[in-house]
């Protein structure tokens, strides 16, 4: 099974025991890490941090040790902007001039592969990105005929519904990928105006009838029945909650809330925990389990956050098993316990390693 | 608020052509879908075609495939429907509808209609 | 042949709750639209989404989906409610498709 992990590059300015450089990752725990994100400047593939070149040799080494890992680097992401990535794909001379500045910069810094993060197409996108994928993949299979190793493309695609119907020409997109990472996670939020979990195994009794697409089950299942390969795809876990601060003394799922939970000391983001963060949480919170969803969440004060843990990312990694499915995807390293000091087990990354142990489990 | 006008109905032959309108303001025209939708007398509703924001994208329901051609003049703010090769059962009112293209998969304005009658 | 089902014709007396239903196949994987047209006028969505009520559309309408099944209710139903109801779905095979229809008839 492969184990793709995403590297945010963001997350080096995070204070004290927050910060996370790629030296800090274990080489032997996934068998693709992605670092997150290269920008495109003049349409040509660049970095976006500073020292993007520095870090990314720092990720690259981690292959000294474990020459089957395999990087690859993630261009877009959420601060790129859909609309910037429209231009350039919808324009065929951009598109060209972007394409063909990508194989030497992965080549120069000593990635295996390409990642495309463009969150998301519009309806208006759906062809450029079908055209872009196509066209990607010819400029790789060229490249590499001198006897080079053809270099990877990968896609992270959404999991909601919507967007998977406007966005993606899944069979068609399926065919030219050699793995597609589908992003099952922030299915709920705080405009919903309700607690809710963000990631859900399945549906659930506790999901009404506009959740009823919105769990890990449903987008799985949807991918498959519009043509992606099992074999192909890469079920998304995070190891990171989503928190939400309470308006009444309900504390149960659908309680109403007033909005995103209080930034987390580290990540400093309303509404997002990291797991090393809720780790601190959980001292003295309430820890619930929806059963039918097959995920817990953990209420302290008037704050409620949705999370993954132990238990239920190996309720995930079995349930992708047995959808036969090409293994799990991690969003992200650096938010898992990556010290190993928060969650109290000595363990470093102990949420993927669990995943990684319950893939290989027979 | 959003106005969506047709015209351009009227009673003709089988094996003739009628071109419908639809004249539309009160929104961004060029920012959304735009679909025909005809209703037989006393049946229900049928989607014809859609057209996307920029024209670029067209689709047709299979009974009007190959007769019907779904046009628009985003300067003009107007809708139009090609009907070549009418049959009897063509004959209906046609609506034209909004769709907000980037994510719906609905109607959400409509227009009066216009009747067609196909008819020797 | 309709990829989604509706009985023809249901009746409810003034004040009580109507419920009509959309079945199909395709529903279990896409939203339901309905639709009310009242006799010489154009369709007016009512409900989208599932369950969302556009803006000026009364708090007596609402929607539910199960299973395969989509369903409209009226609750407290008014006069003013007799008027033919569609369901409406989008499929990436079938594209745009509607239901038959449903007459709904207030009676007294």
């Known amino acids: 099974y492969k184990l793709v992990c995403y590297y945010t590059s963001w997350s080096q300015y995070r204070e004290g025991d927050g910060s996370c450089f790629p030296d800090a990752l274990d080489r032997f725990l996934c068998t693709h890490i992605i670092y997150s994100f290269a920008n495109i400047s003049n349409d040509h593939i660049d970095t976006w941090e500073w020292n993007d070149v520095t870090l990314y040799g720092m990720l690259n080494t981690l292959k000294n040790r474990n020459p089957n890992l395999k990087t690859l680097l993630s261009v877009g992401g959420w601060n790129f902007g859909s609309q910037r990535f429209s231009k350039i794909a919808s324009n065929t001379q951009s598109r060209r001039t972007f394409i063909k500045s990508v194989p030497p910069f992965l080549r120069t810094h000593g990635f295996d592969g390409l990642d495309l993060a463009w969150l998301y197409p519009g309806r208006r996108d759906k062809q450029h990105f079908t055209t872009l994928i196509k066209e990607m993949k010819a400029e790789f299979i060229k490249e590499a005929q001198p006897g080079k190793k053809q270099l990877l493309l990968s896609a992270a695609l959404s999991a909601g519904k919507v967007t998977i119907d406007s966005s993606y020409d899944i069979a068609k997109i399926s065919q030219h990928l050699d793995f597609i990472s589908i992003m099952t996670y922030d299915f709920h939020g705080a405009w919903r105006g309700t607690t809710g979990h963000h990631s859900p195994l399945f549906r659930g009794q506790e999901d009404a009838s506009p959740d009823r697409f919105s769990n890990t089950d449903y987008a799985v299942g949807y991918m498959l029945r519009l043509g992606a390969p099992a074999s192909k795809l890469v079920m998304g876990i995070p190891t990171f909650g989503r928190s939400f601060t309470l308006a009444s003394s309900e504390t149960g799922v659908g309680a109403p809330i007033s909005g995103p939970g209080i930034p987390g000391r580290f990540t400093k983001e309303a509404g997002t925990l990291a797991y090393y963060e809720i780790c601190d949480f959980l001292r003295g919170a309430t820890v619930h389990r929806i059963l039918g969803q097959q995920v817990p969440y953990a209420t302290k004060g008037n704050q409620w956050v949705g999370y993954d843990d132990q238990e239920s990312v190996k309720s995930k990694v079995q349930y992708l098993k047995d959808r036969q499915l090409a293994g799990a995807m991690v969003w992200a390293l650096d938010l898992d316990d990556f010290q190993g000091s928060f969650c109290g087990q000595d363990l470093r990354f102990p949420l993927t390693n669990a995943i990684k142990d319950a893939l290989a489990a027979t | 608020q959003v106005q969506l006008v047709e015209s351009g109905g009227g009673v003709v032959q089988p094996g003739r052509s009628l071109r419908l309108s639809c004249a539309a303001s009160?929104?961004?025209?060029?920012?959304?879908?735009m679909h025909w939708v005809r209703q037989a007398p006393g049946k229900g509703l049928e989607w014809v075609a859609v057209i996307s924001y920029d024209g670029s994208d067209k689709d047709y329901a299979d009974s009007v495939k190959g007769r019907f051609t779904i046009s628009r003049d985003n300067s003009k703010n107007t809708l139009f429907l090609q009907m070549n090769s009418l049959r009897a059962e063509d004959t209906a009112v046609y609506y034209c509808a909004r769709d907000d293209y980037d994510s719906t998969y609905y109607f959400d304005n409509w227009g009066q209609g216009t009747t067609v009658t196909v008819s020797s | 042949s309709y990829e989604l089902t509706q009985p023809p014709s249901v009746s409810v007396s003034p004040g009580q709750t109507a419920s009509i239903t959309c079945s199909g196949d395709?529903?279990?994987?896409?939203?339901a639209s309905w639709y009310q047209q009242k006799p010489g006028q154009s369709p007016v969505l009512v409900i989208y989404h599932d369950t969302k009520r556009p803006s000026g559309v009364p708090e007596r309408f609402s929607g539910s989906t199960s299973g395969n099944t989509a369903t409209l209710t009226i609750s407290g139903t008014q006069a003013m409610d007799e008027a033919a109801y569609y369901c409406?779905?989008?499929?990436?095979?079938?594209?745009?498709?509607f239901g038959g229809g449903t007459q709904l008839t207030v009676l007294g």
């Open positions: 395709i529903l279990a994987d896409q939203y």
């Open positions: 009160g929104f961004t025209f060029s920012s959304y879908g």
């Open positions: 409406q779905a989008w499929d990436i095979n079938t594209a745009w498709v």
